[in-house]
């Protein structure tokens, strides 16, 4: 084994290095000392380190480690943060487009139903946005509310335009009749199926991205234990105490130390791998009725067809509703 | 392509969300994200090695520091000696992950379970529960991009019409069209506290 170079007789080099870490030289001995109070950089002979220096080295080592960890995860963190933001905005744009398409459909085909239809459509798409962002709203309830709200307007404006405007009494009856008589056929059910499937997947996709950010943030800001700090100090700084300023840690030694320091973090690995593969599986399935862009941007046409269905069955519906809601209508005509 | 009748749209404006290709769609962007994420699949298991390779480590030098003394880089002592009579590395490993790490592992387990239950099994294009009470699902041909509703050859085909990153925004409200939302690129500004 080659003999170690003689320690710096004056600790001058050590002082100048340490000064970069800690301005003020009062902690660095003038000449090598026995160092019997040292707890980490245990000396084999005289040393240029003091207990205070050792503590500062430990602090610096842990800080170095935290910075290295942050720089390691920077690209990954940015990738997920940027995509989470882009997708969230893109989904908002899809919802806004879908709302505008639906409003335009009403304006062009059923002008007599506006502005009430605009209001109900607006409320529906607001709920869609809130649901995507994690709000505790039931999709079936959203769709039911849309059709419950639309039907009284369709009935009073399209099917039975002779009714007076102040149709509050009959409105409640019409809302009930809408479900009991399956006024829109199976269109509400079709829309429920498509919207709930596509929004569930969209919502979990965004949740997963946001959790990805949380995972990186958690490991990014880990505080390393004192034991780890001591190991890092021994690896990176104890050589300074012997005046070995330019020497670097052995590669294998570094790996052993890092595995020790990061044993807890590495436990995430299994679940992180599973996370990425599960997210890939979800994304592969995000098409057709599992793709909110596809479903929401086509919603206006399904709603249009549902109204056409009502019109095709208008004769039978008007008769049945006339009987069912007769009491409400009589009250109004008085 | 999707059927969006022209008379539906009053205003046509260019919508840009980020600086990316014109033909990019939400689904292509999702796939691109997954491909990039997959390059980070070993991120956590590779961390120790990554940190060693990005901190001062003896590579070309004959001699290296093993925590106690200067040794030859390829000697047995290079990895072992520095650990003798030091605090026990095994002990350090046995302590288990920090509470925050355990918490995040639990959250990952939960989201993984959710992702698995939400994933569409291969081969199941549309749920057959659309068959009930008159609506029928049918098959979407493999050659089709997307389909909606209950049709086979012609469910509503939408080629992810919202080219969400550089696309015509068919907004009725002129003010509704978002402008450029450029993301800042990360700055390489970490301060290193190493001194050799």
């Amino acid at each position: 084994q080659p003999p170690p170079p003689p320690p710096d007789a004056t600790c001058h080099q050590v002082r100048s290095f340490f000064q970069r870490l800690q301005p003020g030289l009062k902690w660095v001995p003038e000449t090598p000392v026995p160092g019997s109070d040292l707890q980490v950089c245990l000396p084999k002979g005289p040393t240029c380190c003091s207990r205070k220096m050792e503590e500062k080295y430990q602090l610096t080592a842990r800080l170095n480690m935290e910075q290295l960890l942050q720089s390691a995860s920077m690209e990954l963190k940015f990738l997920i943060i940027q995509n989470a933001a882009v997708f969230q905005e893109a989904f908002e744009i899809v919802v806004r487009h879908a709302k505008n398409y639906t409003n335009a459909m009403f304006k062009n085909n059923y002008p007599s139903l506006t502005p009430q239809a605009f209001e109900f459509v607006g409320e529906f798409f607001t709920d869609v946005s809130l649901y995507i962002l994690g709000s505790d709203i039931n999709v079936d309830d959203m769709v039911n509310e849309l059709f419950d709200s639309l039907f009284p307007v369709i009935y009073t404006q399209l099917m039975n335009p002779g009714l007076p405007d102040s149709a509050l009494d009959i409105n409640e009856c019409l809302r009930g009749a809408r479900r009991d008589l399956k006024v829109f056929g199976n269109f509400p059910k079709l829309i429920m199926t498509q919207v709930s499937k596509s929004l569930q997947v969209t919502r979990i996709f965004l949740q997963a991205l946001n959790l990805g950010i949380e995972v990186i943030n958690t490991t990014d800001h880990l505080k390393f234990s004192k034991d780890c700090g001591r190991m890092l100090t021994r690896m990176w700084y104890c050589s300074y105490c012997q005046g070995l300023m330019m020497v670097k840690p052995c590669g294998g030694y570094c790996n052993v130390v890092m595995q020790g320091c990061m044993a807890g973090v590495v436990e995430i690995d299994k679940y992180w791998r599973e996370y990425i593969l599960s997210l890939e599986e979800l994304v592969n399935g995000m098409y057709r009725i599992y793709d909110m862009e596809n479903v929401l941007l086509g919603l206006f046409s399904t709603i249009h067809d549902s109204i056409q269905y009502v019109q095709k069955n208008a004769g039978k519906l008007t008769t049945t509703i006339g009987k069912l809601c007769a009491h409400s209508q009589q009250r109004q005509y008085r | 392509s999707a059927y969006y009748p022209e008379d539906l749209f009053i205003d046509k404006k260019v919508l840009k969300v980020a600086h990316v290709e014109h033909e990019e769609t939400l689904s292509s962007r999702r796939r691109e994200l997954i491909q990039k994420l997959k390059s980070f699949i070993s991120f956590y298991s590779a961390l120790p090695g990554y940190i060693c390779s990005h901190s001062p480590v003896a590579e070309n030098d004959t001699l290296c520091w093993n925590g106690q003394e200067l040794v030859e880089r390829y000697s047995q002592k290079a990895a072992r000696n520095g650990m003798k009579n030091q605090f026990n590395l095994h002990e350090l490993k046995m302590k288990g992950p920090e509470p925050v790490v355990s918490q995040i592992i639990d959250k990952l387990k939960h989201i993984n379970q959710l992702l698995r239950t939400m994933s569409v099994p291969k081969g199941r294009v549309l749920d057959k529960n659309l068959d009930e009470e008159g609506f029928e699902s049918g098959d979407c041909g493999d050659d089709e991009d997307e389909c909606i509703g209950g049709s086979g050859d012609g469910m509503m085909k939408v080629k992810n019409q919202l080219r969400f990153l550089a696309e015509l925004a068919y907004d009725l409200d002129v003010d509704d069209v978002p402008g450029n939302n450029q993301q800042a690129t990360p700055k390489d500004n970490e301060i290193s506290t190493f001194h050799n």
């Epitope: 046409s301 004769g315 | 509703g149 209950g150």
Partner: antibody, heavy 119, light 107 residues
């Protein structure tokens, strides 16, 4: 002028499936529903169901749910009807017909497709 | 489902004659009734809808009447091209159903 062109005569084995087509021209395909009607030899007409080409949503006569699947392809202005698990009872002439406005009045009909189910 | 019954099932008449075909609905369908004509080996053709409105291009010798459950189609001064089978159909709601048919042939 409005035309509905149906696929030609079809012969199928019992248990098999068959897909009939109806190509529309002369009007905006997505604006009107397409219905399918069955007529057995020497018998009356039966409404099978309709497809709303705009959204691709089908609606069925309960009697034909599970037997017929209606689809539409907007790009080619074509409506399709698939009949599955064929039996001799399915031997008939099948017509496609265009809706006249928002009602079950059929103003234009295809020429019909004769389907024979025989082993 | 609403049942539609036509009478007579068949009818023989000569060119120039006037004939009336009737259709009865199993429940009140108001005026939601359509009449079609079908010739041998051909597809049906729309004649009358909403019980009495003549479809475009249909000669004025055809006329529809009735409401509720009883309807009729009257053909004045029969022409050679008028022979065939006539079907009534309600369009009161889902599912639309057709009558049993009335075959009109040359005497």
């Amino acid at each position: 002028q409005v035309q509905l062109q149906q696929s030609g005569t079809d012969l199928a084995r019992p248990g098999a499936s068959v897909k009939l087509s109806c190509k529309a021209s002369g009007y905006t395909f997505t604006s009107f529903g397409i219905s399918w009607v069955k007529q057995r030899t020497g018998q009356g007409l039966e409404w099978i169901g309709e497809i709303y080409p705009r959204s691709g949503s089908p609606y069925y006569n309960e009697k034909f749910t599970g037997k017929a699947t209606l689809t539409a392809d907007k790009s080619s202005s074509t409506a399709y009807m698939e009949l599955r698990s064929l039996t001799s009872e399915d031997s008939a002439v099948y017509f496609c017909a265009k809706d006249f406005g928002s009602s079950y009045v059929f103003d234009y009909w295809g020429q019909g497709t004769a389907l024979t189910v025989s082993s | 489902d609403i049942q539609m019954t036509q009478s007579p099932a068949s009818l023989s008449a000569s060119v120039g004659e006037t004939v009336t075909i009737t259709c009865r609905a199993s429940e009140n369908i108001y005026s939601y009734l359509t009449w079609y004509q079908q010739k041998q080996g051909k597809s049906p053709q729309l004649l009358v809808y909403n019980a009495k409105t003549l479809a475009e291009g249909v000669p004025s010798r055809f006329s529809g009447s009735g409401s509720g459950t009883q309807f009729s189609l009257k053909i004045n001064s029969l022409q050679p091209e008028d022979f065939g089978t006539y079907y009534c159909q309600h369009h009161y709601g889902t599912p639309p159903t057709f009558g049993t048919g009335t075959k009109l042939d040359l005497k």
